[in-house]
Amino acid sequence: ESGYAQNGDLEDAELDDYSFSCYSQLEVNGSQHSLTCAFEDPDVNTTNLEFEICGALVEVKCLNFRKLQEIYFIETKKFLLIGKSNICVKVGEKSLTCKKIDLTTIVKPEAPFDLSVIYREGANDFVVTFNTSHLQKKYVKVLMHDVAYRQEKDENKWTHVNLSSTKLTLLQRKLQPAAMYEIKVRSIPDHYFKGFWSEWSPSYYFRTPEINNSSGEMD
């Protein structure tokens, strides 16, 4: 593909809606940052369409995105992370639509991992812990986490807890006895950076003890 449209194609292209959204991930691969963009309309014909970012880059004026199926992607150390860049959808040399974006305001953290729940019998509670790669990062270190849990049978009845640490205690008396629970966690930038929620961590499943009939307490 040349990346250039015939005149008729260009006229057709101008009738389409090329609105798009992007997110950045900082220090996602060592000191490399990434930027991912996609069209809002999944039915856009992306043949011959390219994305380009210009401005607020180190040592270069512009960078072209790589196309990976329906998304457009850059991984580079060349983001200045200061000021606004211009991100454009192009057909050949013609820009169809552009957005001015500060990459530090569209940050999507990496998903938390190693989520686990440990029951403490003496304390009658559950200690939830998880890990995040952001603790080791230079830039996006401060995150707000959203822990969501539900009884497995209650499909859409999630309870959410926001916290800034990676440890949470759930009191046993707040949970149903002898029930299977699903729990998951995601993160969003908090302080210094703005952006979007990460993907959810893989879910963790745990069972609450049964009630001990003689004492009225859970086992």
Partner: nanobody, 118 residues
């Protein structure tokens, strides 16, 4: 109507320090990148330092890295340039700039003169 006002310049001995301030009256200050640029006599403007909207990201030219520090106070709409170990070649007019948009600073102050005597 004046939107960026620099202060803190003056005459200083080589090896000395100065702290420049720049107060902005631009409504978008807290979401704008800020920077400092200098112009030595008979030379072009030279980028020195820039800082992102939150203060988390900074960038320096090789000529001032390790000697100058840029910072900001979004509550006071002010950006600072702490200049240490000054050299005679640091002499010039120091300009504050705001809103780095696609490699162009959108707003400029009138500048403040810094003279380093040896």
């Amino acid at each position: 109507e004046v939107q960026l006002v620099e202060s803190g310049g003056g005459l200083v001995q080589a090896g000395g320090s100065l702290r420049l301030s720049c107060e902005s009256s631009i409504s978008t200050f807290s979401s704008d990148a800020m920077g400092w640029v200098r112009q030595a006599p008979g030379k072009e403007r030279e980028f020195l330092a820039a800082i992102g909207w939150s203060g988390a990201v900074t960038h320096y030219s090789d000529s001032v890295q390790g000697r100058f520090t840029i910072s900001r106070d979004n509550a006071k709409n002010t950006v600072y340039l702490q200049m240490n170990s000054l050299k005679s070649e640091d002499t010039g007019r120091y300009y504050c700039a705001e809103d780095y948009d696609t490699d162009v600073w959108q707003y400029w102050g009138q500048g403040t003169q810094v003279t380093v005597s040896s």
